[in-house]
């Protein structure tokens, strides 16, 4: 969490941003909130990016003002206009790309004063893993697949029964570059699995951590998966 204040005491307002991650090929949100004003026409929101000459986005007098917008962001940005009055200056970014990563500044002017806060925005790819029993294998084998990751993640297997066990010797992980030549498909195979046990395939990079669980019994197979972003730090 980054909390920024205006420069001159009495005329400063609090602006809060949250470091976040964008999944390339999706829309992303850069979070920013501020002390609200009672008049929308008195609020100015400017988003800037370090190293970029033009503005990322500007909203003033109740509407978008994009004449100074940098070409890199043309047609891609929006604020939530109906939520500005309650102090939401968050930015929506269409079709996030790797090049969108960097340091952004959310700069606010209201009738109460000015304030700004920086935000670290990471970009990469992350997806939910799916764990299945590999019936083609000669022994009981599990196959964990996740379609898109970047940067290259680590893959670790764990088991409920053998807690703390190191499965690196009985697993094999491969990374296959996807057609757009950025993201990669992750495939990890775990050999010699035992029945009546729950296995977890954990995929992690510096942006996200995802886990796929599978419980194999004589009568059924149960699966579940979840994903969490790692760098949601507020400023």
């Amino acid at each position: 969490l980054i909390i920024g204040f205006g420069i001159s005491g009495r005329h400063s307002i609090t602006v809060t941003t949250v470091a976040s991650a964008g999944n390339i090929g999706e829309d992303g949100i850069l979070s920013c909130t501020f002390e609200p004003d009672i008049k929308l026409s008195d609020i100015v929101i400017q988003w800037l990016k370090e190293g970029v000459l033009g503005l990322v986005h500007e909203f003033k007098e109740g509407k978008d003002e994009l004449s100074e917008q940098d070409e890199m962001f043309r047609g891609r940005t929006a604020v939530f206009a109906d939520q500005v009055i309650v102090g939401n200056a968050s930015l929506r970014l269409k079709n996030v790309q790797l090049t969108d990563a960097g340091t952004y500044k959310c700069y606010i002017i209201t009738s109460k004063g000015k304030g700004n806060a920086n935000l670290e925005y990471k970009t990469g790819a992350f997806s939910m893993p799916e764990v299945n029993v590999d019936y083609n294998a000669s022994s009981e084998t599990l196959r964990c697949e996740a379609p898109r990751w970047f940067p290259q993640p680590t893959v670790v297997w764990a088991s409920q029964v053998d807690q703390g066990a190191n499965f690196s010797e009985v697993s094999n992980t491969s990374f296959e570059l996807n057609s757009e030549n950025v993201t990669m498909k992750v495939v990890s195979v775990l050999y010699n699995v035992t029945i009546n046990n729950t296995y977890s395939c954990m995929i992690e990079n510096d942006i996200a951590k995802a886990t796929g669980d599978i419980k194999v019994t004589e009568s059924e197979i149960k699966r579940r998966s979840h994903l969490q972003l790692l760098n949601s730090k507020a400023s």
């Epitope: 999944n23 390339i24 090929g25 999706e26 829309d27 986005h57 509407k63 978008d64 994009l66 043309r74 047609g75 891609r76 940005t77 929006a78 604020v79 206009a81 109906d82 929506r92 269409k94 079709n95 790819a125 997806s127 379609p147 898109r148 996807n178 057609s179 757009e180």
Partner: antibody, heavy 116, light 109 residues
Framework: EVQLVESGGGLIQPGGSLRLSCAAS????????MNWVRQAPGKGLEWVSV???????DCADSVKGRFTISRDNSKNTLYLQMNSLRAEDTAVYYC??????????WGQGTTVTVSS | EIVLTQSPGTLSLSPGERATLSCRAS???????LAWYQQKPGQAPRLLIY???SRATGIPDRFSGSGSGTDFTLTISRLEPEDFAVYYC??????????FGQGTKLEIK
């Protein structure tokens, strides 16, 4: 040259299925938001479905549960699987690339007629 | 659900005249996500304006877009014979993800 070419349209009975294809050249499908948009005879444009660069998909309520958008990255091709077709699905179907600057590349369209 | 309402439904003008087409949204739309398209009979739509006011590649400068919030305008400063067509506005980002207006037919008077 940046181009989209649709195929797969035709005459189909109500309740039937059809798969439309859209072959892309000059750009990579999986780096863009790719859409299907349709136009019923004498009517306006109606958005049908999108597949994001990430592979996630979304579609209009009118086709939810019946139509599925997909892509084959190795063939650089977009698809629309249409099941449980109805008379009101009769239209020209366009595939369109939504680049950063709006739907800037369109195919020529393929006609789907649902009739008994 | 965002509804885009275009007016007039039909606009009858002569070559050389100025055309003003309106697109009104039922709730606020980001300027970045508002586009205009031209469609001629038997052809696919063609992108004219994106980001409410930026001309797409190859579009003549007689076409201009303006507006913000809920009111957007497409202006053709001096009509050429090839400009007579149907024009659609379109938004991105709300539910449904993409919405088109019903269209304005620009016909020769």
């Amino acid at each position: 040259e940046v181009q989209l070419v649709e195929s797969g349209g035709g005459l189909i009975q109500p309740g039937g299925s059809l798969r439309l294809s859209c072959a892309a050249s000059g750009f990579i499908v999986s780096r863009n938001y790719m859409n299907w948009v349709r136009q019923a005879p004498g009517k306006g444009l109606e958005w049908v479905s999108v597949i994001y660069g990430s592979g996630r998909t979304d579609c209009a309520d009118s086709v939810k549960g019946r139509f599925t958008i997909s892509r084959d990255n190795s063939k650089n091709t977009l698809y629309l699987q249409m099941n449980s077709l109805r008379a009101e699905d009769t239209a020209v179907y366009y595939c369109a690339r939504d680049g950063d600057y709006g739907m800037d590349v369109w195919g020529q369209g393929t006609t789907v007629t649902v009739s008994s | 659900e965002i509804v885009l309402t275009q007016s007039p439904g039909t606009l009858s003008l002569s070559p050389g005249e100025r055309a003003t087409l309106s697109c009104r949204a039922s709730q606020s739309v980001s300027s970045s996500y508002l586009a205009w398209y031209q469609q001629k009979p038997g052809q696919a739509p063609r992108l004219l304006i994106y980001g409410a006011s930026s001309r797409a590649t190859g579009i003549p400068d007689r076409f201009s877009g303006s507006g913000s919030g809920t009111d957007f305008t497409l202006t053709i400063s001096r009509l050429e014979p090839e400009d007579f067509a149907v024009y659609y506005c379109q938004q991105y980002g709300s539910s449904p993800l993409y919405t088109f207006g019903q269209g304005t037919k620009l016909e020769i008077k």
